[in-house]
């Protein structure tokens, strides 16, 4: 840009140097040159001379008009054509910006990752504003009425040390730029309800050599939360559809989960957990790939055969990835195992 230019005159912008994208804009240039009665005044945008919509107002001043200006940034300067001078003479320059007022922040979510010592709040910022936009996060205790504010650009981490006064808070976010301000909806937060258990990790898997081979997946977490509900999803690497198994877990010991899988196939497993009865999930764990052993007998493989069904009651769901680029956005077709056949349930989003 041209923020430190020595002007021999003035340049100003109506409605202002930062304005709403798509507005009509007038830029004025007024010369105050010594020993020059300019024949012409010229405007340049980003170094290129402008040809249209220029009006000479009087001897010293000219205006250029833009209909529906839609560039996020431009630098403007103007020059004079002085008699007897070979080159144009610089008068002044200005950086101009256009943008949008912020959208109201949406989908405000606050979680405490176990052992992190922080409450992390995130939100959707909406459409790009193209100009400097700040987010002010308000955290108000519902017990003491004390309010704290934090400045953020896209998310905020608030030390739980500064949230010692109470357990219940009201959280909201203001989006602010020079074109406007919008508030998110307020979020009621109880600190005990937003803890996400420490990461769950699949440590190993093995397939037994039994008549009906089974795969045992071992997984663990360092969580101190006693009641944890988990999901493990799995599929062959060639498949788009996930199956999901649900578990109540107690991480005082390593978890073992049994699966009856197709032989000689490469499977990928992932696990995620939440505190039982709460709504915030861990992200899915890193994919764990396991190759099942080759079939030794001649038994025909039936994915819904009885050995699978004869485990303790559980729900297995089938989940189809919408696209390989969005592994976390899934559509889930719940299917409860009953008499060896899948029974379709409702779609729900687990992404």
């Amino acid at each position: 840009g041209i923020t430190s230019i020595n002007c021999s005159g003035d340049m100003w912008v109506e409605p202002g140097e930062i304005f709403q994208m798509g507005m009509n804009v007038s830029i004025y240039c007024q010369e105050a040159l010594k020993h020059c009665r300019p024949r012409n005044l010229y405007f340049y945008k980003n170094g290129f001379k402008e040809e249209f919509d220029i009006t000479r107002i009087n001897r010293t001043t000219a205006r250029i008009w833009y209909k529906g200006f839609s560039e996020p940034h431009a630098y403007m300067h103007c020059t004079a054509e002085c008699p007897g001078h070979f080159q144009e003479t610089l008068i002044c320059g200005k950086d101009i910006s256009s943008g949008h007022p912020p959208d109201a922040p949406s989908n405000l979510t606050c979680v405490i990752y176990e052992y992190s010592g922080n409450m992390t709040c995130t939100w959707n910022t909406g459409k790009p504003t193209y100009i400097d936009t700040k987010y002010i996060v308000h955290v108000k205790s519902l017990e003491t009425e004390e309010e704290q504010q934090y400045l953020a650009s896209s998310y905020v981490k608030i030390s739980t040390d500064s949230l010692q006064g109470s357990r219940k808070y009201l959280v909201w976010v203001q989006a602010v730029n020079s074109l406007g301000m919008e508030n998110s909806q307020q979020l009621h937060v109880h600190l005990d309800d937003i803890v996400i258990p420490s990461a769950s990790i699949i440590s190993r898997a093995e397939t037994t050599n039994d008549t009906v081979p089974k795969t045992i997946v071992y997984w663990k977490s360092k969580t101190m939360i006693e009641k944890v509900f988990c999901e493990m999803r799995y599929k062959t690497t060639t498949n788009q559809t996930w199956s999901v198994k649900e578990f109540d877990a107690n991480f005082t010991y390593v978890q073992q989960s049994e699966f009856y899988l197709e032989p000689d196939s490469k499977y990928v497993f992932q696990v995620r957990c939440q505190e039982t009865g709460k709504r915030n999930w861990q992200p899915w764990s890193s994919p764990f790939v396991h190759q099942t052993s080759q079939e030794t007998g001649k038994r025909n493989w039936q994915p819904w055969s009885s050995p699978f069904v004869h485990q303790t009651s559980q729900t297995v769901s089938q989940v189809t990835a919408k696209s390989s680029h969005e592994p976390q956005k899934m559509e889930m077709l719940s299917a409860t195992i009953f008499r060896g056949h899948p029974a379709s349930g409702n779609h729900q989003d687990i992404g």
Epitope: E17, I18, S97, I131, D132, K134, I136, Q148, Q149, Y150, L151, A152, S153, V156, K157, S162, V176, N177, S178
Partner: nanobody, 116 residues
Framework: QVQLQESGGGSVQAGGSLRLSCAAS????????MGWYRQAPGKERDLVSM???????FYADSVKGRFTFSQENAKNTVYLQMNNLKPEDTAMYYC??????????WGQGTQVTVSS
Amino acid sequence: QVQLQESGGGSVQAGGSLRLSCAASGDTYSSCTMGWYRQAPGKERDLVSMLMGDGSTFYADSVKGRFTFSQENAKNTVYLQMNNLKPEDTAMYYCGCATLGSRTIWGQGTQVTVSS
């Protein structure tokens, strides 16, 4: 840690003017996003004006065209020129230093009372 001290408040008739000052001390002032806030009794502390990183200034709709935010870097001081004051501008006015990810630091505040 930044310390902030406001001054310039007082009582004024509707239509009058006041100029608030906020002097900052401390070595992290340069990283502050400075703002003026106000809090009426029983209400939240609301943002009135803030200096943005691109050199522009935010003004709340209720004060646009009447209030002007300025700063004097050499003195580590910011100002809020308030013209055409209205009774609804009555509040405690605070300046604040906000840095990304940190809790906003406030001054002690200065009272502005506008009578009709």
